[in-house]
């Protein structure tokens, strides 16, 4: 195989378009990301260039290994689209577009509890709301560190609600909720709310 490729050979599949990818597609503002531009042809010395729209961001030479471009996504317009150009001598091919999804992280949610007390049961309604963060937000409710609800998806800035009925317990119960959106590995928790045991008239959240 020729080390130097002429443009005639570009008409064949000897020099296909490069591939542009990133391990993270969903990012938050201020996040550092790495973009990888690679080519199937491992024997050629290739010059890789990265573009966001028509703005040239950088150039690297490589042979057999992907070119790595490190960026910081600080503004909405930096979400893309990005393209990578692979060039050998005067011949070039561009990758498909790659765009990031910029997501604002969720802030710590607030858990509110409302209880209706009967002689035998407590009817508990849990409300959880994160006032900031890109929608949709998935909320999960916990009792004593164990999930007691499925993930509840909210596409509006309204609290997630979960109802449960419990026999009047003899022990304290601790509740909290988790808020999570599309940002990977990024979840926040409410402050725990402790529900006291039923000894005496101690039900601060109860509707009398």
């Amino acid at each position: 195989r020729k080390a130097v490729l002429d443009c005639e050979a570009m008409k064949t599949n000897e020099f296909p378009s490069p591939c542009l990818d990133s391990k993270t597609k969903v990012v938050m503002k201020g996040q550092n990301v790495s973009m990888f531009c690679s080519h199937k042809n491992k024997s050629l010395q290739i010059t890789y260039s990265l573009f966001r729209r028509k703005t040239h961001l950088g150039t690297q030479d490589g042979k057999g290994e992907p070119a790595i471009f490190n960026l910081s996504i600080t503004e909405a317009h930096e979400s893309g689209p990005y393209k990578c150009k692979a060039q050998v001598t005067s011949c070039s091919k561009y990758s498909r577009d790659f765009s990031f999804t910029i997501v604002d992280p969720v802030t710590s949610p607030v858990l509110n509890i409302m209880v209706i007390q009967t002689e035998t049961d407590r009817h508990i309604t849990l409300h959880c709301l994160s006032v900031n963060g890109s929608l949709p937000i998935n909320y999960t409710f916990f009792e004593n560190h164990v999930a007691i609800s499925p993930a509840i998806s909210k596409y509006d800035r309204e609290p997630a609600e979960f109802n449960l009925t419990k026999k009047n317990p003899g022990e304290e119960e601790e509740y909290r909720c988790e808020a999570k959106n599309r940002l990977p590995n990024y979840a926040t928790y409410s402050h725990p709310v402790t529900m006291p045991s039923t000894g005496g008239d101690s039900c601060p959240f109860c509707l009398k």
């Epitope: 443009c7 570009m10 028509k54 703005t55």
Partner: antibody, heavy 123, light 112 residues
């Protein structure tokens, strides 16, 4: 109807300045395009001058020969782009076209053109 | 600079004729196919006919076709119609340290 309308052309003396306007109707600049200027001297080739991106940052792209004397700007609230031309010479005499293209790196072709405005540089 | 050379600079033909115009760039255009063709009638703005060397722009009749890659490109009108008498331009694009959008100087198609 989607259209581009250029204005501001006319007779100017060598060394003088002129600002051309391109008003876009039926186009929402917030949809993000490159708004460009291309000129055509009488009986000569078309010649690309430069472009401005209508998105928030407004990246500019110029032909290397145009840098310095020619400045492109925009007013998104008026859906208008401008071409400021300084230190004009006789060879700048041409019909100046406003043209639109997509904002992606592969949107290099001009898919909408205005009717052009004539600039004559002469003493 | 990238130079786009069109040939012929003018040609005369009759309605129904097959017309071929060539465009040669001084170096390979970007992506091997970033070349567009435009039609311009006197006193009018250019109109996009073909982009990516061979893709027909919206609303362009199928008698127009484009081919080529790298440095050599062709515009073909399979059966010339009265409304096709005009000047045709090619435009090639590539990036070095700046963007280049270079036009050929045109091929004028007139009635024989």
């Amino acid at each position: 109807e989607v259209q581009l309308v250029e204005s501001g052309g006319g007779l100017v003396q060598p060394g003088g300045s002129l600002r051309l306007s391109c008003a876009a109707s039926g186009i929402d600049f917030s949809s993000y395009y490159d708004m460009c200027w291309v000129r055509q001297a009488p009986g000569k080739c078309l010649e690309w001058i430069g472009c401005i991106y209508t998105g928030s940052v407004g990246e500019l792209y110029y032909a290397s020969w145009a840098k310095g004397r020619f400045t492109i700007s925009r007013d998104n609230s008026k859906n208008t782009v401008y071409l400021q031309m300084n230190s004009l010479r006789a060879e700048d005499t041409a019909v100046y076209y406003c043209a639109r293209r997509g904002s992606g790196v592969d949107d290099y072709y001009f898919n909408l053109w205005g009717q052009g405005t004539l600039v004559t540089v002469s003493s | 600079d990238i130079q786009m050379t069109q040939s012929p600079s003018s040609l005369s033909a009759s309605v129904g004729d097959r017309v071929t115009i060539t465009c040669q760039s001084s170096q390979s255009v970007d992506n091997n196919n970033w070349l567009a063709w435009y039609q311009q009638k006197p006193g009018k703005a250019p109109k996009l006919l073909i982009y990516d060397a061979s893709t027909l722009a919206s609303g362009v009749p199928s008698r127009f076709s484009g081919s080529g890659s790298g440095t050599d490109f062709t515009l073909t009108i399979s059966s010339l119609q009265p409304e096709d008498f005009a000047t045709y331009y090619c435009q090639g694009t590539y990036y070095t340290t700046d963007w280049w959008n270079s036009f050929g100087c045109g091929t004028k198609v007139t009635v024989l």
